[in-house]
Interface confidence: low
C-alpha cells in the first residue's frame, strides 16, 4: 500500500522520480553500446520521513525503528517500485544488437 | 544480476541482513497485535559501496552516476530483495485472527 | 511513420464516463511510454497521466487520481483513458501523446478527441 | 507540483522580428524543459527537448536556452507560417506541467 504522498519537508524534497542527463561515458558503456549517445536517466531520489510513499509493512516498522533507534536502524530509502524499459544499440563481434533492458530506468519511487 | 558480494569497507560493514528485536510498543502495534509480543525484525542494513550487491543495472547505472555526481545523485541503497512471511495474532472485534504479512521480514538483501 | 490515431467525439452527461482510444502504428508500441493530455477550449493544456505499455506502470496526476484510468491492449496496439464521474469542467480535447525516449517530452501527438459534458 | 510561468501570454510582432518567450519554474528543472508550437485545432508540435535540442526537422530559426529555473525560447527572424501558441513544459518531476502559453501573431 502506498502511503502518504504529501512531503512534510517542502516541495520537491521528499522520494519523487528525477532526471539524470548522462553520457555513455558518464555510464561507463562507451565501449559496448553505440546508441543512444546519452541517456536520459529516470531514478528515485529524496527523503523519506515518516510514513511517505511507505511500500510495505516492513518500510512502516523501519519508519518506527529509526526513530527509536537512529543509529543503528536506517530510514527508509528512496527506491524504483517499477522500471520502464529501454533499448540500446550494442556493439558485437559481428556488428550490433538491440537489447531490450527492463531494469534500467526507473518508472515510479516508493520508500523502503 | 547480483554483483560482487566482497566488501571493501571491512567485515560486516556493507549491506546485509541484521537483525533488530522491537517490541509491539516500539512498533506501536500494542493496541490491535496481540502474539508475538516481540518480534525478531530482520532488515537489511549497511553500505552499497561500488559494485556490491548490485540488484540490476539500473544500481549500476546509480553507482557510476554517484561516483560523477555524489552532490546531486545518492549512492545505492541497502534494500530487501526478498521477504520471510510472519503471522501475526491480531485483536479483532469478535475476538482475534491470525494474519499472514509477507513484506514484513526482510530475508535477503542487494543494492539498489 | 509514427501515428497515433484516436477515436471520434463524445458527448457525455455530467456523471457518465468516457472512454478515449488511442491506436499506435510506425513503432513498437512497447517501447515507449504513452502519455494523456487535455485541452479545455482556449485554454493551456494539462497532463493527466502516463502508461507504460510494457508493464502497465501508470504514474496519474494526482488531480486525476481516482477518476482517470488508464490500460493499454498490447495485442490491437491501442491504449486508452477513461474518465469517470464527468461533470461539465472535462469538457476538452483529449491528446494522447507518445513519450520521448528516456524523457517525458511528448514527439508525436494524437489528432486528439473532443469530449463534451453537458446535461 | 512545479509551476510553470510564461510570459508574455500574447505578443505582436513583425515577419522578420527576432521573438523572445520566457519560461520560469518555480524551482530547479536541470535543463528538463520542452518547447512546442500549436496550431489552432491542431496536437501541439514538439519543437525542442533538453531546453535546446531542436528535434529533427524544426527550422534553426528557432532555438532555446536557459538553465536552472529560467529558460528562454526564441524566434529569430518570424515568418508569417510561425502563427500560433507556444508552450513550455517541464519533465523534470511528474506530474509534468506545461506553462500557460505565448500567442503570437503578426502585426
Known amino acids: 500500500a502506498r502511503n502518504g504522498d504529501h512531503c512534510p519537508l517542502g516541495p520537491g524534497r521528499c522520494c519523487r522520480l528525477h532526471t539524470v542527463r548522462a553520457s555513455l561515458e558518464d555510464l561507463g558503456w562507451a565501449d559496448w553500446v553505440l546508441s543512444p549517445r546519452e541517456v536520459q536517466v529516470t531514478m528515485c531520489i529524496g527523503a523519506c520521513p515518516s510514513q511517505f510513499r511507505a511500500a510495505n509493512m516492513h518500510a512502516q516498522i523501519k519508519t518506527s525503528l529509526h526513530r527509536l533507534k537512529p543509529d543503528t536502524v536506517p530510514a527508509p530509502c528512496c527506491v524504483p517500485a517499477s522500471y520502464n524499459p529501454m533499448v540500446l544499440i550494442q556493439k558485437t563481434d559481428t556488428g550490433v544488437s538491440l537489447q531490450t533492458y527492463d531494469d534500467l530506468l526507473a518508472k515510479d519511487c516508493h520508500c523502503i | 544480476a547480483r554483483n560482487g558480494d566482497h566488501c571493501p569497507l571491512g567485515p560486516g560493514r556493507c549491506c546485509r541482513l541484521h537483525t533488530v528485536r522491537a517490541s509491539l510498543e516500539d512498533l506501536g502495534w500494542a493496541d490491535w497485535v496481540l502474539s508475538p509480543r516481540e518480534v525478531q525484525v530482520t532488515m537489511c542494513i549497511g553500505a552499497c559501496p561500488s559494485q556490491f550487491r548490485a540488484a540490476n543495472m539500473h544500481a549500476q547505472i546509480k553507482t557510476s552516476l554517484h561516483r560523477l555526481k555524489p552532490d546531486t545523485v545518492p549512492a545505492p541503497c541497502c534494500v530487501p530483495a526478498s521477504y520471510n512471511p510472519m503471522v501475526l495474532i491480531q485483536k479483532t472485534d469478535t475476538g482475534v485472527s491470525l494474519q499472514t504479512y509477507d513484506d514484513l521480514l526482510a530475508k535477503d538483501c542487494h543494492c539498489i | 511513420e509514427v501515428q497515433l490515431v484516436q477515436s471520434g467525439a463524445e458527448v457525455k452527461k455530467p456523471g457518465a464516463s468516457v472512454k478515449v482510444s488511442c491506436k499506435a502504428s510506425g513503432y513498437t508500441l512497447t517501447d515507449y511510454n504513452l502519455n494523456w493530455v487535455r485541452q479545455a477550449t482556449g485554454q493551456g493544456l494539462e497532463w493527466i497521466g502516463d502508461l507504460n505499455p510494457y508493464n502497465q506502470g501508470i504514474i496519474y496526476n494526482q488531480k486525476f487520481k481516482g477518476r482517470a484510468t488508464l490500460t493499454v491492449n498490447k495485442s490491437i496496439s491501442t491504449a486508452y483513458m477513461e474518465l469517470s464521474s464527468l461533470r461539465s469542467e472535462d469538457t476538452a480535447v483529449y491528446y494522447c501523446?507518445?513519450?520521448?525516449?528516456?524523457?517525458?517530452?511528448?514527439?508525436?501527438w494524437g489528432q486528439g478527441t473532443l469530449v463534451t459534458v453537458s446535461s | 507540483d512545479i509551476q510553470m510561468t510564461q510570459s508574455p501570454s500574447s505578443l505582436s510582432a513583425s515577419v522578420g522580428d527576432r521573438v523572445t518567450i520566457t519560461c520560469k519554474a518555480s524551482e530547479d528543472i536541470y535543463h528538463r524543459l520542452a518547447w512546442y508550437q500549436q496550431k489552432p485545432g491542431k496536437a501541439p508540435k514538439l519543437l525542442i527537448s533538453?531546453?535546446?535540442s531542436l528535434e529533427t526537422g524544426i527550422p534553426s530559426r528557432f532555438s532555446g536556452s536557459g538553465s536552472g529555473t529560467d529558460y528562454t525560447f526564441t524566434i529569430s527572424s518570424l515568418q508569417p507560417e510561425d502563427i500560433a501558441t507556444y508552450y513550455c513544459?517541464?519533465?523534470?518531476?511528474?506530474?509534468?506541467?506545461f506553462g500557460g502559453g505565448t500567442k503570437v501573431e503578426i502585426k
Open positions: 501523446a507518445r513519450e520521448g525516449r528516456g524523457g517525458a517530452w511528448f514527439d508525436s
Open positions: 513544459q517541464q519533465y523534470w518531476s511528474p506530474p509534468f506541467t
Open positions: 533538453g531546453a535546446t
